[in-house]
């Protein structure tokens, strides 16, 4: 299964498949997600060792048991691979590193204005995998504001190095984020010329896209048919580059397809993982595990669940069935793709589908209308699970927050729905960050069921939480995907990162935004806001959040909404916007739902009709 | 409309006990704390104690605490204090008042008086 | 325990006239102090609390000030109505009462 928790201060010995340089344990992990092989990681922070050499080390590892002995190491940080995570396997890498610089081919020099800038820079060039930015105060005048734009031959650093003022960051294409844009045509009988930075052989020349859109410096491919000429070079999808970034030539060639690597693609990119089955055809690799199952299908699911498992082989000769089940062959590769294709076989041939981050139909979890004042807009996929919820009665208008929580489930605040609880009336918008973006034809999902908390009363600010189940379940995106929930009466994690997001009044008396906004709002203890709420009771079902001074809060319009935390790389739903004394008054925090101690209630309600809760737990 | 009556305060000899009870109406006592406070004949205000009602949580001005002892019935939104060990010093009117961070509404008030 | 002394314990003043009332903790309380009025025979009210927070329905001519340890309560204009007994209340760390200020007209 899925496991999210990081060990502080631990290192895995041994199992070493690759190593590499990373600026953080979370971007260490994600290098370990996609890696064919990796199953747990290792990172050094600057600070936990000495030796230069080993600074900011990422070091991936396999096992055959899924597990290696940790030893206690100060400051080094170990995890699991985010495998089998559903939706929270993702290439997208948004933070930016102060005081690091991540060394690379420099390919391009430029001065701008910020940080933000050199990523956008480095996001539309099709070379860039990441950049430094030396800021207006770097110690040398003739370096300052210079964006320099890099890559590595494995898209990772070829170094790290602290400097102060220098902030560093990755290409935010696989976040779906350039603006280059993408080629969709396949070329059929067409051959391109190039460098060669990878060899794998692939059953079509789909799977040969998804492979080079996911690999660092793959920017387009040829793949060789099953019936190419050279039996040697069957299937053989060759990924490519080129100084240009685009194919110097190209050849007519029977038997051949060649295309792009969609990592250019703006607002979608294809699933890191290959669904489809290949009838007739054989898979080969090492021999992982063999058991016998019924069809095809089942085959697949035992390989997804078998985090070790890439392909798999089910096959229909007679010697290998028994009654209605035959052998499954469970494999891997060094590379995660088959060492031999073989075609015109009993066989039925097809991938793990332990990437996809589709993931199964479920929510996720770990073991006074309110109201954004003083914040700042959100950029596309910043805050993916936000969703609004609007009314069409005459007109139709955004009157609440909510937050993705499951392929169909939105959690949200119950007072939303005083004085309009039929579902007919909402429209709920998933994956949008400007409301004037919608129109007529723009997709939106109804309601199917509103279940409001039995406790929450009208105009009382108690047991203020609503599911809604939509009547269609959503695809997920980098644009639209659920958030995290906390584990049941998590009090012991102390979140210092927070952040609340809406389309609500930027002022008290103000009107709904256009952009989405965010503001960063530290959190203030239960016991601090019953201070500052003379007439209220702040419960243990509550959370507050706030600043001392004010000007920065939720306001009318954001209620629902949530309020999110990263903890350990991840974010999770603490709060559900509710109430407060005004916007951002001072010393008045917003109060939220707690969404931690509603836990029980949620998973009760999003049980499935066949008696199957729909969550999952990467804990 | 918010409202806070007390009742029970009499006439107790020293060594006596005695249990005010403080009856709520336009509000649910569970989504609020219950506070009681004492003024003695021409003194100030003293602090005895806080409830929950939702939980029961209470917390007592130490310099009290055995002295008083609160509960709540929230299925008839009444809250009560039981005073034993009583003395003359323990003479008062006592209020209960409900809030959050602090008192924000008030009863009228009980008397009780302690005395041979 | 943190203490309150607040004074003074009686003024007289004249209608129209500007009445303070001064409090002082024996701790630093944050700004957690309340400020009540208690006409003879009546439940206090609430008038100000965080230091200068007025309570709804409160005429604007209560006004709270003060940081740390030191704090003021002031009428700005005295009017008859408000002829009262004023009490402080910190309510950083428990709740602790002044002893009280009686106000009467001139």
């Known amino acids: 299964g899925c496991l999210t928790q990081l060990y502080e201060n631990a290192f895995f010995r041994g199992g070493d498949v690759a190593s590499m340089y990373t600026p953080n344990a979370q971007y260490c992990q994600m290098r370990c997600t996609f890696h064919p092989r990796c199953l747990l990681f290792s990172f050094l922070p600057a600070s936990s060792i000495n030796d230069m050499e080993k600074r900011f080390g990422c070091f991936l590892k396999d096992s055959v048991t899924g597990t290696l002995p940790k030893v206690h190491r100060t400051g080094a940080v170990s995890g699991h691979s985010l495998k089998q995570c559903g939706h929270q396997i993702s290439a997208c890498h948004r933070d930016i590193y102060k005081g690091v610089d991540m060394r690379g081919v420099n390919f391009n020099v430029s001065k701008v204005s910020s940080v933000e800038e050199c990523q956008k820079r480095c996001t539309s060039n099709i070379r860039c995998q990441f950049f430094s930015y030396a800021t207006q105060t770097f110690h040398k005048a003739e370096y300052r504001n210079n964006c320099l734009l890099k890559y590595s031959p494995g898209g990772t650093p070829t170094a790290i190095k602290v400097l102060s003022n220098v902030e560093s960051g990755f290409s935010l294409k696989p976040c779906a984020l350039s603006e280059i844009g993408c080629h969709m045509n396949i070329f059929q009988h067409l051959a391109f010329s190039d460098v060669d930075v990878a060899r794998v052989l692939t059953p079509d020349a789909f799977v040969c896209r998804t492979i080079c859109t996911y690999h660092p410096n793959c920017l387009f491919f040829t793949f060789y048919t099953n019936v190419w000429k050279i039996e040697s070079q069957r299937n053989v999808c060759l990924l490519k580059t080129s100084e240009s970034g685009t194919p110097s030539s190209s050849t007519p060639q029977e038997n051949t397809i060649s295309g792009y690597s969609l990592l250019t693609c703006k607002r979608t990119l294809p699933e890191p993982c290959h669904s489809k089955i290949y009838p007739g055809v054989d898979f080969g690799g090492e021999e992982l595990n063999v058991t016998f199952v019924k069809g095809v299908n089942v085959c697949q699911e035992t390989c997804t669940k078998m985090i070790r498992c890439q392909f798999f082989t089910y096959s229909l000769l007679p010697e290998d069935c028994k009654e209605e089940k035959c052998k499954c062959f469970l494999r891997l590769s060094m590379d995660g793709s088959p060492t031999r294709i073989a075609y015109g076989t009993q066989g039925s041939s097809g991938y793990s589908l332990r990437l996809c981050n589709t993931g199964d139909n479920s929510v996720c979890t770990t073991k006074t209308s309110t109201r954004i004042v003083g914040g700042t807009n959100s950029s596309w996929g910043e805050w993916p699970w936000q969703v609004s919820l609007q009314v069409k009665l005459t007109a139709q208008r955004h009157l609440c927050g909510g937050s993705l929580i499951g392929h169909q489930w939105v959690l949200t605040a119950a007072h939303c729905f005083d004085g309009l609880p039929l579902q007919d009336v909402w429209r709920i918008y998933s994956g949008i960050l400007n409301l004037s973006d919608i129109t007529k034809d723009t997709p939106f999902s109804q309601i199917k069921e509103i279940i409001i908390h039995q406790n929450y009363k009208v105009s009382e600010g108690n047991h203020d939480i609503a599911l809604i189940k939509l009547q269609a379940p959503l695809n997920y995106t980098e644009f639209q995907k659920p958030i995290c929930l906390p584990s049941k009466g998590d009090t012991s994690t102390i979140y210092t990162n927070c952040w609340v997001t809406g389309w609500g009044f930027s002022k008290e008396k103000g009107e709904i935004q256009n952009i989405l906004q965010k503001v960063n709002i530290p959190l203030v203890t239960n016991e601090e806001c019953q201070k500052r709420y003379q007439d209220y009771k702040i419960t243990q079902r509550m959370v507050c959040a706030g600043y001392k001074e004010g000007g920065k809060d939720a306001c009318k319009g954001d209620s629902g909404g949530p309020l999110v935390c990263k903890h350990n790389g991840m974010w999770r739903l603490v709060g559900i916007t509710s109430w407060g004394e005004g916007c951002a008054r001072r010393e008045q925090p917003g109060v939220y739902t707690k969404v931690a101690e509603y836990m029980d209630w949620i998973l009760e309600k999003t049980q499935s009709s066949d008696g199957k809760a729909q969550m999952q737990s990467p804990a | 409309e918010v409202q806070l009556v007390e009742s029970g305060g009499a006439l107790v000899k020293p060594g006596g006990s005695l249990r005010l009870s403080c009856a709520a109406s336009?509000?649910?006592?569970?989504?609020?704390?219950i506070f009681w406070v004492r003024q003695m004949p021409r003194k100030g205000l003293e602090w005895i104690g806080r409830i929950d009602p939702e939980n029961d949580n209470t917390k007592y001005d130490p310099k009290i605490q055995g002295k008083a002892t609160i509960t709540a019935d929230t299925s008839t939104d009444t809250a009560y204090m039981e005073l034993s060990s009583l003395t003359s010093e323990d003479t008062a009117v006592y209020y209960c008042a409900k809030g959050g961070g602090l008192f924000a509404y008030w009863g009228q008030g009980t008397l009780v008086t302690v005395s041979s | 325990d943190i203490q309150m002394t607040q004074s003074p314990s009686a003024m007289s003043a004249s209608v129209g006239d500007r009445v303070t009332i001064t409090c002082e903790a024996s701790h630093d309380i944050n700004n957690y102090i309340a400020w009540y009025q208690q006409k003879p025979g009546k439940a206090p009210k609430l008038l100000i609390y965080?230091?200068?927070t007025l309570q709804s329905g409160v005429p604007s001519r209560f006004s709270g000030s003060g940081s740390g340890t030191d704090f003021t309560f002031t009428i700005s204009s005295l009017q008859p109505e408000d002829i009262a007994t004023y009490y402080c209340l910190q309510y950083d760390n428990l709740f602790t009462f002044g002893q009280g200020t009686k106000v009467e007209i001139k």
């Open positions: 336009g509000f649910n006592i569970k989504d609020t704390y």
């Open positions: 965080y230091t200068s």
